[in-house]
């Protein structure tokens, strides 16, 4: 009876996500058979989040909208480990929007999810950011410095990275 009600709950939760994500990939968390964490297929997972590399080229605003339709945001990078995970799935000759922007062109950078911008946990290429007109951040590869962030014009279409919390069922 207990297992039955747990399964019913799981199914209703899965139905919630079905409109955005017809297929989920779930793994058992720990030893308890009752705790499963899921990411949409074919998203990748790291710690408590799921990531999707969007290869369509769009402006920053459209990229964020595209992520939000899927129940996600443009990626907020909180640690070096997280960035190291993300770059494994990126192409060196491409640039990808992050969920980081400077809406007023005042060098007041902010993350889409309101995570406080911490200068000590940023991975800007050297000499970046450097332009009041470039109000959106991308991650890209430079041969001299490997992967890092750069500020660019928000309306210039780029690929993007979406991030959402794992779905626990």
């Amino acid at each position: 009876n207990f297992m039955y009600s747990k399964t019913v709950k799981r199914l209703s939760k899965l139905r919630e996500y079905q409109q955005y994500h017809p297929s989920l990939t779930c793994v058992m968390e720990g030893k308890d058979i009752e705790d499963w964490s899921c990411c949409p297929t074919p998203w990748t997972s790291f710690q408590s989040s799921c990531y999707f590399i969007s290869t369509g080229m769009q402006s920053w605003t459209k990229s964020q909208k595209n992520c939000s339709v899927m129940g996600a945001d443009l990626v907020v990078i909180n640690t070096r480990e997280e960035q190291d995970f993300i770059i494994q799935n990126l192409k060196r000759n491409s640039s990808y929007f992050l969920g980081l922007s400077d809406p007023g062109g005042r060098r007041h950078w902010q993350w889409v999810d309101q995570t406080p911008y911490n200068e000590n946990v940023t991975f800007w290429h050297s000499g970046e950011p450097n332009n009041l007109d470039e109000r959106c951040a991308i991650i890209n590869f430079r041969s001299s410095e490997e992967w890092g962030w750069n500020d660019i014009h928000c309306h210039v279409p780029q690929k993007s990275i979406c991030k959402m919390k794992k779905i626990y069922i």
Partner: antibody, heavy 118, light 107 residues
Framework: QVQLQQSGAEVVKPGASVKISCKGS????????MHWVKQAHAKSLEWIGV????????NYNQKFKGKVTMTVDKSSSTAYMELSRLTSDDTAVYYC???????????WGQGTLVTVSS | DIQMTQTTSSLSASLGDRVTISCRAS??????LNWYQQKPDGTVKLLIY???RLHSGVPSRFSGSGSGTDYSLTISNLDQEDIATYFC?????????FGGGTKLEIK
């Protein structure tokens, strides 16, 4: 080549307003914000503020808030700066300058002399 | 606001001389230091940006150096056309601010 052409010298009465212009050519106007800089006679340069030619929003030096209004007309690739409630302290040469990489003003207009005199 | 100080307001040198103009910021400006040249007719040109990078079309006799709060502009082989006033400007923090200028004259 990049050119910023400013409007001609103005003589205006105290209390009046004046609007000076800066027309950009030789580049994509909306890709570069426009700065305005003041130079009173035999003095240093003072940054007044900057306007985004793409978004139309401005950042003003606190000192010039309420004195200056910056606007842009994308169709004519022209930036404007209006100075209001003029006093003798506003007598100066005003420059427009294009925004560039590394927080710099990479090209400058020739300057517009505004003289406030009764 | 960040204060920019050019201690030498005027400087006299001979043609061919090596001239150094200095500029100090009231706090660390992370190399966002630019140098401008203003000719006697009022024309303003960018010379050096981001401490040491030469703007396009600027002769290689101009160079810049520095870090933290102390910066300098060097003209290695003074030419007649270098007669002008030189301004430093910090772009690290809004509002952007300028030094008082250094007027360069020929002996």
């Amino acid at each position: 080549q990049v050119q910023l052409q400013q409007s001609g010298a103005e003589v205006v009465k105290p209390g009046a307003s004046v609007k000076i212009s800066c027309k950009g050519s030789g580049y994509t106007f909306t890709d570069y914000s426009m700065h305005w800089v003041k130079q009173a006679h035999a003095k240093s340069l003072e940054w007044i503020g900057v306007i985004s030619t793409y978004y139309g929003d401005s950042n003003y030096n606190q000192k010039f808030k309420g004195k200056v209004t910056m606007t842009v007309d994308k169709s004519s690739s022209t930036a404007y700066m209006e100075l209001s409630r003029l006093t003798s302290d506003d007598t100066a040469v005003y420059y427009c300058a294009r925004n560039g990489n590394f927080y710099v003003m990479d090209y400058w207009g020739q300057g517009t002399l505004v003289t406030v005199s009764s | 606001d960040i204060q920019m100080t050019q201690t030498t307001s005027s400087l006299s040198a001979s043609l061919g001389d090596r001239v150094t103009i200095s500029c100090r910021a009231s706090q660390d400006i992370s190399n966002y230091l630019n140098w401008y040249q203003q000719k006697p007719d009022g024309t303003v040109k960018l010379l050096i940006y981001y401490t040491s990078r030469l703007h396009s079309g600027v002769p290689s006799r101009f160079s810049g150096s520095g870090s933290g709060t102390d910066y300098s502009l060097t003209i290695s082989n003074l030419d007649q056309e270098d007669i002008a006033t030189y301004f430093c400007q910090q772009g690290n923090t809004l509002p952007w601010t300028f030094g008082g200028g250094t007027k360069l004259e020929i002996k």
